[in-house]
């Protein structure tokens, strides 16, 4: 086990603070709620504390919570390849370059690491060339989200990850918007971090409303678990 | 856990004011104002983040009420003016153990019982 493991063996409050600027439309966003990194499970609400969110807030999610990817479930055999907690408490880098296919595209750097016993993820979001009635900026996505798996290969030259994936957005007229999301991971401190072998993250996500929250707002659950690697031969002859 | 406690409420013309403050026994997150009136939900008026930096009122009392508070005191703050009947009720202290404010009562963690506010 990492060091950085044992900070996560219960459930860990969850902090996120987002600063965007879409089209010069700026906002802010706040979140909160708890991640169970055994189960791979988290539970979030967020806010938008400057009025109406410009942008739906399914574009948004991976930001959010595809940026705590240390809650990710990770099996016995695969916990040599968790970067994400090893890098815990002090943390680490992620950004990330979001392409819209045939609309803008979204910059974002965030800080993931520990603040006491919690889990904060503070973000600076920039997004550039969105058509204003496009599905973004036009409001056209459906609020909700599809399964998605996430690709992760070392970087040994930057002492990190690089991560790819293609989000599939439901748009209101039945088609789908891609997004093609480019990250990488970066350690804050320089204490020892896990370099994993090319493996994918397997995530599911549920939006929904609080009835009583009268903010523009978005409720996420979502359960994240790694795979891709099989056991070694010595597991199979066990 | 943390006990709040409500004051200042009381009976006050139309048009007037009155300042609610409310004691914690200890640090709290987020702050808010709630209110009842006779036979309705109970609705959130007012609230400020632990952090300070995020206010939110509702459309109704936008303008006439602020909240602020005072983190050396434990103490938050409802100044209420320009009042009307429509603002009859009683007004609660809600907090929560995290700084994020939000205005849904199931994100509220301690209550106060209350002031009577008549207009």
């Known amino acids: 086990m990492s060091k950085g493991e044992e900070l996560f063996t219960g459930v860990v409050p969850i902090l996120v603070e987002l600063d965007g600027d879409v089209n010069g439309h700026k906002f802010s966003v706040s979140g909160e709620g708890e991640g169970d990194a055994t189960y791979g499970k988290l539970t979030l609400k967020f806010i938008c504390t400057t009025g109406k969110l410009p942008v739906p807030w399914p574009t948004l999610v991976t930001t959010f919570s595809y940026g705590v990817q240390c809650f990710s479930r990770y099996p016995d055999h695969m916990k040599q390849h968790d970067f994400f907690k090893s890098a815990m408490p002090e943390g680490y880098v992620q950004e990330r370059t979001i392409f819209f296919k045939d609309d803008g595209n979204y910059k974002t750097r965030a800080e993931v690491k520990f603040e006491g016993d919690t889990l904060v993820n503070r973000i600076e979001l920039k997004g550039i060339d969105f058509k204003e009635d496009g599905n973004i900026l036009g409001h056209k996505l459906e609020y909700n989200y599809n399964s998605h798996n996430v690709y992760i290969m070392a970087d040994k030259q930057k002492n990190g990850i690089k991560v790819n994936f293609k989000i599939r957005h439901n748009i209101e007229d039945g088609s789908v918007q891609l997004a093609d999301h480019y990250q990488q991971n970066t350690p804050i401190g320089d204490g020892p971090v896990l370099l994993p072998d090319n493996h994918y993250l397997s995530t599911q996500s549920a939006l929904s409303k609080d009835p009583n929250e009268k903010r523009d707002h978005m409720v996420l659950l979502e359960f994240v678990t790694a795979a891709g690697i099989t056991h070694g031969m010595d597991e199979l002859y066990k | 856990d943390v006990q709040l406690v409500e004051s200042g409420g009381g009976l006050v013309q139309a048009g007037g004011s009155l300042r609610l403050s409310c004691a914690a026994s200890g640090p709290t997150g987020a702050m808010a104002w709630f209110r009842q009136a006779p036979g309705k939900e109970r609705e959130f008026v007012g609230g400020i983040s632990g952090s300070e930096t995020d206010t939110y009122y509702v459309d109704s009392v936008k303008g006439r009420f602020t909240v602020d508070r005072d983190n050396v005191k434990n103490t938050v703050y409802l100044q209420m003016n320009s009042l009307k009947p429509e603002d009859t009720a009683v007004y609660y202290c809600?907090?929560?153990?995290?700084?994020?404010?939000?205005?849904?009562?199931?994100?509220?963690?301690?209550w106060g019982r209350g002031t009577q506010v008549t207009v």
């Open positions: 809600a907090a929560r153990r995290r700084i994020t404010l939000f205005t849904s009562r199931t994100d509220y963690d301690f």
